[in-house]
């Protein structure tokens, strides 16, 4: 999906008001310096591409993020404010169903959510030069 035509300001507002709080809740008890950010993005569409991938695609050691509250609200934001996004999602999650269970907070998942927080922060500051 090409995120170029999303309403970035509305997605940013939803992130700041709600999604960010759910990410913090997920990470509670973890030091903010515990993980190094290794995933980056260069502009808002690219950031959303990376955010979608990290949130919804199972990875080795962390298959459960797509069932978390922040993931549901992320999907809702993308579906509402990215034209045609929901049409690209046909059965996208159905193949993962059996592998996804909530409440398995592994260290790998915490690291992945830490990366997500970094991507969202970058999404919110689109005019900053890439480090």
């Amino acid at each position: 999906y090409d995120f170029t035509n999303c309403d970035f300001e509305k997605i940013k507002a939803a992130y700041l008001s709600t999604i960010s709080k759910d990410l913090i809740t997920y990470m509670s008890g973890t030091k903010s310096t515990e993980f190094n950010n290794t995933v980056s993005c260069s502009n808002r569409p690219h950031c959303l591409t990376e955010i979608q991938s990290l949130t919804f695609n199972p990875t080795a050691g962390c298959a459960s993020l797509a069932k978390e509250m922040f993931a549901m609200k992320t999907k809702a934001a993308l579906a509402i404010w990215c034209p045609g996004y929901s049409e690209t999602q046909i059965n996208a999650t159905q193949a993962m169903k059996k592998r996804r269970k909530r409440k398995v907070t592994t260290n790998k998942c915490l690291e992945q959510v830490s990366q997500l927080q970094g991507l969202w922060r970058r999404f919110n500051r689109p005019l900053l030069k890439q480090q």
Partner: antibody
Framework: QVQLVQSGAEVKKPGSSVKVSCKAS????????VNWVRQAPGQGLEWIGQ????????DYAQKFQGRATLTADKSTSTAYMELSSLRSEDTAVYFC??????????????WGQGTTVTVSS | DIQLTQSPSFLSASVGDRVTITCSVS???????LHWYQQKPGKAPKPWIY???NLASGVPSRFSGSGSGTEYTLTISSLQPEDAATYYC?????????FGQGTKLEIK
């Protein structure tokens, strides 16, 4: 304008199943989660689960896992809630409600009018 | 599961009174995830307050909400006859989504 119109009242026997429909109009059906909530007579509200019509993704309250099935038909913009192995305690009004961002806060905005399901032998 | 406990469960007050309903949450949640609904007999619940303190469209300004962590309140500054209803708090912080048991507000 946004509307959620639910199917009519049902009377069912214990052990049978019921399927309640919720027809959406006035918005892009596939882009919004649909929640299902029930209310037993004189009681409070109880969340059953939710479905994202875009890809059929679902979440259920553990209490209803395996007994409730949420589906959605994008061609008719209709969400369904099927409850099996009915017992008298399932007698309730069942509501569908659209999940959305309201002033950047995520919650439900539009609700169906409710469907009364009575389970009686 | 996160439990929400409302107090009181029943409240009778006079027109013009200041009324406060409390919602206690079993574990701390973000204020952005606490909402209030109003329900009248035979009707579907109506969103009333989002994110602790943001009034839904059409809700009179005599209503307000506040709180953080585990304690939240809905306040009516000057009770009107049309405010007679049952009010529910709800959390969107973690699954399963849960509601308070409701506070039935009656006009004396």
């Amino acid at each position: 304008q946004v509307q959620l119109v639910q199917s009519g009242a049902e009377v069912k026997k214990p052990g049978s199943s019921v399927k309640v429909s919720c027809k959406a109009s006035g918005y892009t059906f596939s882009s919004y989660w649909v929640n299902w909530v029930r209310q037993a007579p004189g009681q409070g509200l109880e969340w059953i689960g939710q479905i994202y019509p875009g890809d059929g993704d679902t979440d259920y309250a553990q209490k209803f896992q395996g007994r409730a099935t949420l589906t959605a038909d994008k061609s008719t913009s209709t969400a369904y809630m099927e409850l099996s192995s009915l017992r008298s305690e399932d007698t309730a009004v069942y509501f569908c409600a659209r999940g959305t961002y309201y002033n950047n806060y995520y919650g439900t905005d539009y609700w169906g009018q409710g469907t009364t399901v009575t389970v009686s032998s | 599961d996160i439990q929400l406990t409302q107090s009181p469960s029943f409240l009778s007050a006079s027109v013009g009174d200041r009324v406060t309903i409390t919602c206690s949450v079993s574990s701390s949640i973000s204020s952005s995830n606490l909402h209030w609904y109003q329900q009248k007999p035979g009707k579907a619940p109506k969103p009333w307050i989002y994110g602790t303190s943001n009034l839904a469209s059409g809700v009179p300004s005599r209503f307000s909400g506040s709180g953080s962590g585990t304690e939240y309140t809905l306040t009516i500054s000057s009770l009107q006859p049309e405010d007679a209803a049952t009010y529910y708090c709800q959390q969107w912080s973690s699954y399963p989504l849960t509601f308070g048991q409701g506070t039935k507000l009656e006009i004396k």
